[in-house]
């Protein structure tokens, strides 16, 4: 059941990113580190970079509440088992600052791409009976 919940959480994050993409014009147009083409075993490290990025509401429109709630939900910490797996390869993974910086629209697109990849990896690891994803 934990594995199913994990998958639900990852898919929920994809939906949150989709919702935020509707509000790109209401986000601070700041350039943020946006991992792309993340190498195998560095997915959790890249995920952490996306979570650390200072995505912010521009506080200009009426969508400030939903934007702030969504951003905060994107930063929900995965459990320590996943954090442990993240750490396993942290020495060989690029630092957050080394990734190309992109404006919010591309940042969110790349975040979604990573989440899709992690979701597929999780599915295939379950199919092959592995618990290590």
């Amino acid at each position: 059941q934990g594995q199913d919940r994990h998958m639900i959480r990852m898919r929920q994050l994809i939906d949150i990113v989709d919702q935020l993409k509707n509000y790109v014009n209401d986000l601070v147009p700041e350039f943020l580190p946006a991992p792309e083409d993340v190498e195998t075993n560095c997915e959790w490290s890249a995920f952490s970079c996306f979570q650390k990025a200072q995505l912010k509401s521009a506080n200009t429109g009426n969508n400030e509440r939903i934007i702030n709630v969504s951003i905060k939900k994107l930063k929900r910490k995965p459990p320590s088992t996943n954090a442990g797996r993240r750490q396993k390869h942290r020495l060989t993974c690029p630092s957050c600052d080394s990734y190309e910086k992109k404006p919010p629209k591309e940042f969110l697109e790349r975040f979604k791409s990573l989440l899709d990849k992690m979701d597929h990896q999780h599915l295939s690891s379950r199919t092959h009976g592995s618990e290590d994803s």
Partner: antibody
Framework: QVQLVESGGGVVQPGRSLRLSCAAS????????MHWVRQAPGKGLEWVAF????????YYADSVKGRFTISRDNSKNTLYLQMNSLRAEDTAVYYC???????????????????WGQGTTVTVSS | EIVLTQSPGTLSLSPGERATLSCRAS???????LAWYQQKPGQAPRLLIY???SRATGIPDRFSGSGSGTDFTLTISRLEPEDFAVYYC???????FGQGTKVEIK
């Protein structure tokens, strides 16, 4: 069982204050965001306020901003709504509701209000 | 801020009939963010559907939700006597409710 019980409603004059309470039981209160929602007589539902599970963020409807304050005491499993400068248009049944999206990664994941109290009536009248 | 418009305002049907309730958003809503509630007179609302199409715990399978973008639908396949109530859609995160659709006995 999972339960929310509101209290503190009553009749109050315009401009006065009132504090509503919502006692939670049957679940880990500190893992859930909480809402206040109201319903004026014969009208629809109106969201009033939300507080994050740890109290770190609070959000308010424009109609109550600056007058109402949502707070919580996780050690007492209780949610509060402090209502100041009350107006006739604040007359309503006030419900507390649990946000269905738990802070726990493996917890509940509903984007909705999944548990509701029975409501407490607030009447603002001179 | 997003506005949710529900239609029709009132739906007059007989038990056993199919009810189709509409909720239209003024801006695109990610399906995870759309919920439906049922409220009977003198009672608190009850969560029926979350994520546009997932039934909440204990909700009978005659209730189903669908839709994406700006158009969402709640369908009750065969109305039972206890289903006559007011139904609200809601956008999560802004927590805006639609104005409600009353399903009444014809």
């Amino acid at each position: 069982q999972v339960q929310l019980v509101e209290s503190g409603g009553g009749v109050v004059q315009p401009g006065r204050s009132l504090r509503l309470s919502c006692a939670a039981s049957g679940f880990t209160f500190s893992s859930y965001g909480m809402h206040w929602v109201r319903q004026a007589p014969g009208k629809g539902l109106e969201w009033v306020a939300f507080i994050w599970y740890d109290g770190s963020d609070k959000y308010y409807a424009d109609s109550v901003k600056g007058r109402f304050t949502i707070s919580r005491d996780n050690s007492k499993n209780t949610l509060y709504l402090q209502m100041n400068s009350l107006r006739a248009e604040d007359t309503a049944v006030y419900y507390c509701a649990r946000d269905g999206d738990s802070s726990d990664w493996y917890g509940d994941y509903y984007f909705g209000m999944d548990v509701w109290g029975q409501g407490t009536t607030v009447t603002v009248s001179s | 801020e997003i506005v949710l418009t529900q239609s029709p305002g009132t739906l007059s049907l007989s038990p056993g009939e199919r009810a189709t309730l509409s909720c239209r958003a003024s801006q695109s809503v990610s399906s995870s963010y759309l919920a439906w509630y049922q409220q009977k007179p003198g009672q608190a609302p009850r969560l029926l559907i979350y994520g546009a199409s997932s039934r909440a715990t204990g909700i009978p399978d005659r209730f189903s939700g669908s839709g994406s973008g700006t158009d969402f639908t709640l369908t009750i396949s065969r109305l039972e006597p206890e289903d006559f109530a007011v139904y609200y859609c809601q956008q999560y995160g802004s927590w805006t409710f639609g104005q409600g659709t009353k399903v009444e006995i014809k």
